[in-house]
């Protein structure tokens, strides 16, 4: 004959363990029910009467089967250089992520604790690894042949165009100006995602390091996360 | 390549004092400038700062009652309001180094003397 | 938010000795971090930058090292030159932070 099912509370076999969905109640010495997502133990169970559950109140929750006497509290509204991303319900907390083009600074178990702006890079670097969601954007200068002219948390060193009669040589920061008025554009190898077209390395230029009053580059690209910084637009 | 603060005197609480911060031989298009303050036998306080890109940040502190801007090419300034004596301090303009290629990594390289601001009844 | 804590002052060196000062995060900073020297009546110097890059012109018996909450700033070969004001600075948060530097750590030259 099959065992017969044994319904909650009831007192489990000397070393034995609770069901799934069921805990055991040292008062009670009892296998209990569990409460599902969304509420929490009211009263809890004795000898003879199972828990009783109840919903959890506005602005709480619990995302688990649970004996909580409580429910969890939501966390704080997101701030204003958040998003949010998960709404606070009876059965999850609220979820806040950093809004586009801001990254995670300071994380916390589930979200962000405190969001940072994309820094930028300056005339003469260019983006050598673009921010995500939990880093920064790395700066890296630009190499001989290449320039950036903008001050982006997106652009790359691109290189500098091939004049037939070169007027001004490029730099890192500045591009050729060629005394004709067509230069030649051709695509660098492997650069077909860029959103505008580049030309290969110019031979008739010859460009000077960008601006930095860092002697190296020790600081660029450090072992490990890039190393952030916290900035909010202004007032 | 210089800084230079002005603008520091003896006000008395609740005056509104804008302090100048003009530089030589820098771009501001290119570097950003900060405000730090030091009061009188104390410690380095970071107030704030302004971008290359024209972007301000404050220290909580500060949110609210100091404001920077950039008043011209060569000019940054720092308008402060309902000062106390607790904001008698040296005031000191700074250029951020830009390290790493950033537009701004809060590390100054190069500082003003300060000027003085007393605020006194 | 971020605050910083130094080691306290005054820290005694003995000229041609070694000083040691450290300088703590309450949260990572990764390498965000500096280190100014500051004489009276005269404004901060930067020293380090990135917890362990030597400034231009600062003397090599400067070095910086640390890297996440703890670092340090040691002086080998103390002259009396180097009798100052030590800060460090973290360089990872600008706004909910009420400061970004550190107390000070005094050093004194015997």
């Known amino acids: 004959l099959p065992a017969q099912v044994a319904f909650t509370p009831y007192a489990p076999e000397p070393g034995g363990t609770c069901r799934l969905r069921e805990y055991y109640d040292q008062t009670a010495q009892m296998c209990c029910s569990k409460c599902p997502p969304g509420q929490h133990a009211k009263v809890f169970c004795t000898k003879t009467s199972d828990t009783v559950c109840d919903s959890c109140e506005d602005s709480t929750y619990t995302q688990l089967w649970n004996w909580v006497p409580e429910c969890l509290s939501c966390g704080s509204r997101c701030s204003s250089d958040q998003v949010e991303t998960q709404a606070c319900t009876r059965e999850q907390n609220r979820i806040c992520t950093c809004r586009p083009g801001w990254y995670c600074a300071l994380s916390k178990q589930e979200g962000c604790r405190l969001c940072a702006q994309l820094r930028k890079c300056r005339p003469g670097f260019g983006v050598a690894r673009p921010g995500t969601e939990t880093s920064d954007v790395v700066c890296k200068p630009c190499a001989p042949g290449t320039f950036s002219n903008t001050t982006s948390s997106t652009d790359i060193c691109r290189p500098h165009q091939i004049c037939h009669v070169v007027a001004i040589p490029g730099n890192a920061s500045m591009d050729a100006v060629c005394t004709s008025t067509s230069p030649t554009r051709s695509m660098a190898p492997g650069a077909v995602h860029l959103p505008q077209p580049v030309s290969t390395r110019s031979q008739h230029t010859q460009p000077t390091p960008a601006p930095s009053t860092a002697p190296g580059t020790s600081f660029l690209l450090p072992v490990g996360p890039s190393p952030p910084a916290e900035g909010s637009t202004g007032d | 390549q210089s800084v230079e603060e002005s603008g520091g005197r003896l006000v008395t609480p609740g005056t509104p004092l804008t302090l100048t911060c003009t530089v030589s031989g820098i771009d501001l298009s290119s570097y950003t400038m900060g405000w730090v303050r030091q009061a009188p036998g104390k410690g380095l306080e970071y107030i704030g700062f302004?971008?290359?890109?024209?972007?301000t940040y404050y220290a909580n502190w500060a949110k609210g009652r100091f404001t920077i801007s950039k008043t011209s090419s060569t000019t940054v300034d720092l308008k402060m309001t309902s000062l106390t004596t607790e904001d008698t301090a040296t005031y000191f303009c700074a250029r951020d180094g830009g390290y790493g290629g950033y537009d701004y990594t809060g590390i100054f390289n190069l500082w003003g003397q300060g000027t003085l601001v007393t605020v006194s009844s | 938010d971020i605050v910083m804590t130094q080691t306290a002052s005054p820290v005694s060196a003995a000229v041609g000795g070694t000083v040691t000062i450290k300088c703590q995060a309450t949260?990572?900073?990764?390498?965000?971090l500096a280190w100014y020297q500051q004489k009276p009546g005269q404004p901060p110097k930067l020293l380090i930058y990135g917890a362990s890059t030597l400034e231009s012109g600062v003397p090599s018996r400067f070095s910086g090292s640390g890297s996440g909450t703890e670092f340090t700033l040691t002086i080998s070969g103390v002259q009396c030159d180097d009798a100052a004001t030590y800060y460090c600075q973290q360089g990872y948060i600008y706004t909910n932070v009420d400061n970004t530097f550190g107390g000070g750590t005094e050093v004194v030259v015997k």
């Open positions: 302004i971008s290359s890109s024209g972007h």
């Open positions: 949260e990572s900073i990764s390498s965000w």
